[in-house]
Amino acid sequence: HSFGPGPGLGTPRSPCNARGPCRLFFRVCLKPGVSQEATESLCALGAALSTSVPVYTEHPGESAAALPLPDGLVRVPFRDAWPGTFSLVIETWREQLGEHAGGPAWNLLARVVGRRRLAAGGPWARDVQRTGTWELHFSYRARCEPPAVGAACARLCRSRSAPSRCGPGLRPCTPFPDECEAPSVCRPGCSPEHGYCEEPDECRCLEGWTGPLCTVPVSTSSCLNSRVPGPASTGCLLPGPGPCDGNPCANGGSCSETSGSFECACPRGFYGLRCEVSGVTCADGPCFNGGLCVGGEDPDSAYVCHCPPGFQGSNCEKRVDRCSLQPCQNGGLCLDLGHALRCRCRAGFAGPRCEHDLDDCAGRACANGGTCVEGGGSRRCSCALGFGGRDCRERADPCASRPCAHGGRCYAHFSGLVCACAPGYMGVRCEFAVRPDGADAVPAAPRGLRQADPQRFL
């Protein structure tokens, strides 16, 4: 609801930093609750950026105060079931406006991180977070997108005409008309044969199976090389020299080490922790993170996962840090919104990658015969008669300025305007009084209506 200096933190200062007008953007990032900030830098549950962005102008000598934030919601679409426990990261970015701002145009002012527990469908939770000298007041809540309902958005409730035993306000849920609750949604990829779940997004293994998706037989577990499986409670004995030694990836999968463990990149047609699951078809849902599965109608034909933006790998299992590419030109700020990459451009630039210079006549044409004029570090369009607007796209009403003097009637014409003068007046704008004795016409004193030059819309 507001952002500004915290109480009792030395000399109060404005977020605009006494450098002229500025805008504040808020980037909201959701991470799994179990993730550690140091190891998990990706917004795996989703991310979004504020769009309702007013300009704040600081007046010299004014005492710095918290800036009120607009009511515009920041909506973060989350994938799969709502986990309940999550890490909430809110970054406050300042864009300095104005020609004489000096210094960088973009600054990360504050970054608040905190673990939260929140059921979907509950009321707004209010919070105050302090970081450094800044204080952020905000509210948050989680809501399910229909037809999902419940604290984890894991139940799919579609209206059914069949009679039901459900209580008031509750509807029976597909696929069980006699039930008011559908089974929880397990972690994506959890083995349907060897895994089950009691809570959303979990994967509990049946006896004899292990691994995060219950795809690894305990007999081979994660014990590599000379490591031997110990009792179920103790795991592996005799640790070997490296997680990829002996290549734990089956079926031609390639192994890579990741923070003391390993990761298998599986060839098409195989997946699982060690690429041990084969004969997979699209019906098995092998594509993660919203990937689209094509082909693979039967176990003998390979499927292909078409990954959504931000994911890659044969099963769309890997998230890509796309901002590391630095796609934004001309000092634009890269923001990974999860589903899309967005460049926030500095003033005077536009385009998906801030590639268009709006202050440059070479970068933008004027429509309808208008002429581009540069000056003072900016550009404008000098429009042809009859056109107006920033790019001369708007048809102007040449009669709007009442250019015909002395009661003359104005008519719009394709080349401008025509004045039909009242009796006793003549001239392009009816500016001359006609002498009855035939002498030369003379400019007449204005009579109610002012004389006007031909109007051009800029």
Epitope: P77, R322, L325, H339, A340, C343, P352, E355, G363
Partner: antibody, heavy 118, light 112 residues
Amino acid sequence: EVQLQQSGAELVRPGALVKLSCKASGFNFKDYYIHWVKQRPELGLEWIGWIDPENGNAIYDPKFQDKASITADTSSNTAYLHLSSLTSEGTAVYYCASEDAYYPFAYWGQGTLVTVSA
Amino acid sequence: DIVMSQSPSSLAVSVGEKVTMRCKSSQSLLYSSNQKNYLAWYQQKPGQSPKLLIYWASTRESGVPDRFTGSGSGTDFTLTISSVKAEDLAVYFCQQYYSYRTFGGGTKLEIK
């Protein structure tokens, strides 16, 4: 599933105006730029311009500056291409496509055939 | 404006053959700050909309077979199909997205 659904074919008289639509679904409309591309038989693909639905800013190829106008309605997740003073050279298939900062034209509409004929 | 030129305008090959098509831009598409080339390749099959194959000159789009490879930098770029299949019959366009957007004239791939 990401989709760009374009309006149906149009038969228009020379000198007339036409308004083509491109409805987006499966993604956050405001986070992507929407482009319009013209394709005439044997003449390849010609870029017309783009619009940023977040703020309504539009940029055009100078040769389409007087002929085309692009708008967007965020309430219906729809982008529009307005073509004016059409001649026989306006007969073409017009595509819309979406772009973010990472991917160029990742998703395309199915195209709308505009025929200009007396 | 950046002008994009493609060659050849058409070519006919047998299934299994290697194909190379070229694209030349009138000015460099290499952005010095990130050392990336703002160039993409599209495939348009008869009666269909174009489909993104390659972006950043050499990054293969998800789901695109690995027989398609993009290479080159600056003003000269190449799309290679290592072993042509019958379903590769299409017109291939290059496009720059460095400034405005412009497409090459296309290379029509026919199967003998």
